[in-house]
């Protein structure tokens, strides 16, 4: 998927439905690709991405990828089709309404990824499943 400023014409008359027969229409996701981040050692972070995009295809979900290596921390926000791997990993949690980060094995870095299926759900990335989104101590992530 590509963000709106380079989005190409799409005209697919197929109606996409989920497993329960509910119609799936393109959802809204944060879409800033890769940005430097200061989100570290927190239960939850906000993406601080100002771009909300309409995903190109109805089956796409919101994805966030948090990576830390010796040099920096980055946060990636995109739309992606859960039928296709992303960064070589399957999006196992694509039906979740919340973006709950799961660690993945990647050599040379700490790598967390989450996916979710409610509008703009990759704006709030959760590293602790016990974390309650109404927690007033929510810390904002600041991009460089």
């Amino acid at each position: 998927t590509i963000p709106p400023h380079v989005q190409k014409s799409v005209n697919n008359d197929m109606i996409v439905t989920d497993n329960n027969g509910a119609v799936k229409f393109p959802q809204l996701c944060k879409f800033c690709d890769v940005r430097f981040s200061t989100c570290d050692n927190q239960k939850s972070c906000m993406s601080n991405c100002s771009i909300t995009s309409i995903c190109e295809k109805p089956q796409e979900v919101c994805v966030a990828v948090w990576r830390k290596n010796d040099e920096n921390i980055t946060l990636e926000t995109v739309c992606h089709d859960p039928k296709l791997p992303y960064h070589d990993f399957i999006l196992e949690d694509a039906a979740s309404p919340k973006c709950i980060m799961k660690e993945k094995k990647k050599p040379g870095e700490t790598f967390f990824m989450c996916s979710c299926s409610s509008d703009e759900c990759n704006d709030n990335i959760i590293f602790s499943e016990e974390y309650n989104t109404s927690n007033p101590d929510l810390l904002l992530v600041i991009f460089q």
């Epitope: 709106p4 400023h5 509910a22 229409f25 309404p97 299926s117 703009e120 704006d123 109404s134």
Partner: antibody, heavy 116, light 107 residues
Framework: EVQLVESGGDLVKPGGSLRLSCAAS????????MSWVRQAPGKGLEWVGR??????????DYAAAVKGRFTISRDDSKNTLYLQMNSLKTEDTAIYYC???????WGQGTLVTVSS | DIQMTQSPSSLSASVGDRVTITCRAS??????LNWYQQKPGKAPKLLIY???SLQSGVPSRFSGSGSGTDFTLTISSLQPEDFATYYC?????????FGQGTKVEIK
């Protein structure tokens, strides 16, 4: 099939209150941002406000013309969107549409007439 | 708020004509621009989103272009069912404002 059905439109006096409802079906209501858009007779479209998903806090945004008078809420257990309108003015007379925010799904609209 | 200005406010055209409607934003909105069609007594229908992406089910005679502040909706060959009012809407910032509309009438 996605369906949005508004109800609650009526004739009301200036200063009065009214609550509109929008019953949603055919999609996962709890996952979607929802909006109200209105259209005064013979005029253009005007965005009224939106409510975001409950999991992201159910945050609301409003147009300046209705802020402080109108309240948008949602009940995900009933798949229903609401618009509580207080301190109504004659210029609030319009057809009110319920929509899935920024996507092409609209209700048929419900007419609100504010007149003495 | 971002102001959206459409021109012309109305136009008369014949079946088969090429029709162009323009929309100007009071500040840059990147490509966060949608076009709607509305017929009397009906809810609006989304034609184009993200300035140039054709909504599912919309005929290919409709196209959109532009970015920044200036945008265009083009109907390559006007059909009888295209006589309606067209609105642009920016979704770059809240509130997502509409243009005042362009009524396309039969000449």
């Amino acid at each position: 099939e996605v369906q949005l059905v508004e109800s609650g439109g009526d004739l009301v006096k200036p200063g009065g209150s009214l609550r509109l409802s929008c019953a949603a079906s055919g999609f996962t209501f709890s996952n979607a941002w929802m909006s109200w858009v209105r259209q005064a007779p013979g005029k253009g479209l005007e965005w009224v406000g939106r409510v975001k998903t409950t999991v992201s806090g159910g945050t609301t945004d409003y147009a300046a013309a209705v802020k402080g008078r109108f309240t948008i809420s949602r009940d995900d257990s009933k798949n229903t969107l609401y618009l509580q309108m207080n301190s109504l003015k004659t210029e609030d007379t319009a057809i009110y549409y319920c929509t899935i925010d920024l996507r092409d799904y609209w209700g048929q609209g419900t007419l609100v007439t504010v007149s003495s | 708020d971002i102001q959206m200005t459409q021109s012309p406010s109305s136009l008369s055209a014949s079946v088969g004509d090429r029709v162009t409607i323009t929309c100007r934003a009071s500040q840059s909105i990147s490509s966060y621009l949608n076009w709607y069609q509305q017929k009397p007594g009906k809810a609006p229908k989304l034609l184009i989103y993200a300035a140039s992406s054709l909504q599912s089910g919309v005929p290919s005679r409709f196209s959109g272009s532009g970015s920044g502040t200036d945008f265009t909706l083009t109907i390559s060959s006007l059909q009888p069912e295209d006589f309606a009012t067209y609105y642009c809407q920016q979704s770059y910032s809240t509130p997502p404002t509409f243009g005042q509309g362009t009524k396309v009438e039969i000449k």
